[in-house]
């Protein structure tokens, strides 16, 4: 059976039906994807340009595949099973009158059905299933997948993975504002900032006075203590953690299977035994890895280390002297942690703009 071999999928609404407001169409597809993400580990992100895994379009008649639409009634839509190119795409017959109510053809109900195909589900012979081949109106506000639908989609992707809750350990390490406090790794995780140190991490919402502390093992039993570098790709909900010659991927706060992997698979030379610090710059779509006196640059789009690296930190980051403990990307600046201090660095103008205590994030 066809299935996507990844958990994070993109979709794009290529064009819109004139029958409905654009924002209604956007909302309906968001909710239709949510129907499937609620019962699986799958996560969906909307693109506004470029090729997405699942391209959604409205069309009359012939529209670029062998499956011409037949005018009003009859075939309402069709979708392709998972795979590259046209595969995974969902096409809606523009000859229908698409609505968000019981009149015409309810877009939400047809979208849930077609996206089931886009995820690999076949038609069901159970009339209660959303994958039953015949359209019938159900109230979208009370719509629920049948047990059949849930069982079938979970046979492809498994059950949803609940993100663990961040709890406070019983004996938190003492004072933040200790003069010489340094961090092993610092990164954003969604709206929070995580400060890794030994076997625990502090986390806080910027601007909020509250600071929380959690042991690494209590939230991620498979992740070792002593994390040395970390970065987040927020648009994908991905967190990467590094220790020695290994790295781990945390998806939506859940460790991904088949990790750890070797850092050499990213393109590091054999001379690199550990990464001191890492930061992802979303504007450039690059990860900067700091290793002793040098830094490496990784292209996340191509999944390749950029050629001509490593380069000297001191040459390309004026005002920054090795060695670096941690780097945080926050509001278009890099915060470069070195011992008890951090440097606020503007990558656009390539200069240090502030020197702060490393604990300044905690109101120290």
């Amino acid at each position: 059976r066809s299935r996507w071999m990844k958990r994070y999928l993109t979709y794009r609404i290529y064009n819109y039906t004139p029958d409905m407001k654009r924002e209604d169409v956007d909302y309906i597809f968001q909710k239709a994807f949510q129907v499937w993400s609620d019962v699986t580990p799958l996560r969906f992100r909307k693109l506004h340009k470029d090729e997405a895994d699942i391209m959604i379009l409205f069309a009359f008649g012939a529209h670029g595949d062998f499956n011409y639409f037949d005018g009003k009634g009859g075939t309402l839509a069709h979708a392709f099973y998972p795979g590259p190119g046209i595969q995974g795409d969902a096409h809606f017959d523009e000859a229908e009158t698409w609505t968000k109510s019981f009149q015409g053809t309810n877009l939400f109900l047809v979208a849930v059905h077609e996206l089931g195909h886009s995820l690999g589900l076949q038609h069901s012979n159970n009339p209660k299933s959303i994958m039953y081949p015949t359209y019938r109106y159900l109230n979208p506000s009370t719509f629920r997948l049948s047990a059949d639908d849930i069982r079938n989609i979970q046979s492809l992707y498994g059950a949803p993975v609940k993100p663990p809750s961040l709890t406070k350990p019983s004996s938190p390490p003492s004072t933040f504002c200790h003069q010489s406090l340094s961090f092993d790794a610092v990164t954003t995780v969604g709206e929070k900032i995580f400060f890794f140190k030994d076997w625990f991490f502090w986390w806080k919402l910027p601007g909020s006075p509250a600071t929380n502390i959690t042991s690494i093992s209590s939230i991620w039993p498979s992740i070792p203590s002593g994390i040395q570098a970390a970065y987040e790709i927020e648009s994908r909900n991905q967190l990467f953690l590094f220790k020695d010659e290994k790295y781990w991927l945390i998806n939506n706060l859940v460790p991904e299977p088949h990790y750890p992997r070797s850092i050499y698979s990213l393109g590091f030379s054999a001379s690199v035994k550990k990464v001191d610090a890492a930061v992802f710059d979303p504007l450039r779509q690059k990860v900067y890895f700091f290793v002793d006196k040098h830094y490496w640059r990784y292209d996340v789009r191509q999944e390749l280390m950029d050629p001509a690296y490593p380069k000297l930190i001191s040459t390309h980051f004026p005002g920054i002297k090795p060695k670096i403990d941690a780097v945080l990307y926050f509001k278009r600046h890099y915060y470069i942690f070195q011992g008890a201090y951090q440097l606020e660095y503007d990558p656009l103008f390539r200069r240090v703009t502030k020197t702060l205590k490393s604990t300044s994030w905690f109101g120290c």
Epitope: Y14, E51, M55, H63, G64, F66, F80, G83
Partner: antibody, heavy 122, light 103 residues
Framework: EVQLLESGGGLVQPGGSLRLSCAAS????????MSWVRQAPGKGLEWVSG????????FYADSVKGRFTISRDNSKNTLYLQMNSLRAEDTAVYYC???????????????WGRGTLVTVSS | DIQMTQSPSSLSASVGDRVTITCRAN??????LNWYQQKPGKAPELLIY???SLQSGVPSRFSGSGSGTDFTLTISSLQPEDFATYYC?????FGQGTKLEIK
């Protein structure tokens, strides 16, 4: 390694018949749409016919509709093209091509055979 | 019915040149356009699918772009092995081909 091997081509008189075969190997044949595409000598590519994984759905170019029949035998991993009432303009190299899997065909031909030459001449 | 018009029908160029071939549909085909390369006496090979996705194993000097009705295939730096005929295609419709010859 995906392989498609056409056979059954040859010289045939106008009005005659010919059956082409395409033996597939190196992939699971049954879930994929398959097509025949032809190329007249010195000319461009022309899609001829396509068939669904189960064989239940078939498509034909207008130029061959009613004369050609596409079929498949999934137990033998083989695609067929039965060509009747052949005309001089059917002279071409006939290629079989693998399409995508699933309920609908896209015409994304990622693997092709080497082709078999059909010559219709008196 | 959808028709595909490819231009130019033939093209002379030199090794190292940047070459662009265009394909136009008479109505929107969204991003459902594929490009194939065919060398004399050989079967066609898929280069680009879904307008811009490079087929596995195809050199990165080949790229595709476009959506709706207008599409292009670009070869950034011609290599000797790239002299061939190129076809655009969507579903059952092929363009008439562009023969790329050595200048």
């Amino acid at each position: 390694e995906v392989q498609l091997l056409e056979s059954g081509g040859g010289l045939v008189q106008p009005g005659g018949s010919l059956r082409l075969s395409c033996a597939a190997s190196g992939f699971t044949f049954s879930p994929y749409w398959m097509s025949w595409v032809r190329q007249a000598p010195g000319k461009g590519l022309e899609w001829v016919s396509g068939i669904s994984p189960s064989g239940g759905i078939t498509f034909y170019a207008d130029s061959v509709k009613g004369r050609f029949t596409i079929s498949r035998d999934n137990s033998k991993n083989t695609l067929y093209l039965q060509m009747n009432s052949l005309r001089a303009e059917d002279t071409a190299v006939y290629y079989c091509a693998k399409d995508i899997r699933g309920a609908y065909s896209s015409g994304l031909f990622d693997y092709w055979g080497r082709g078999t030459l059909v010559t219709v001449s008196s | 019915d959808i028709q595909m018009t490819q231009s130019p029908s033939s093209l002379s160029a030199s090794v190292g040149d940047r070459v662009t071939i265009t394909c136009r549909a008479n109505q929107s085909i969204y991003t459902y356009l594929n490009w194939y390369q065919q060398k004399p006496g050989k079967a066609p090979e898929l280069l680009i699918y879904a307008a811009s996705s490079l087929q596995s194993g195809v050199p990165s000097r080949f790229s595709g772009s476009g959506s709706g009705t207008d599409f292009t295939l670009t070869i950034s730096s011609l290599q000797p092995e790239d002299f061939a005929t190129y076809y655009c295609q969507q579903a059952g419709i092929f363009g008439q081909g562009t023969k790329l010859e050595i200048k």
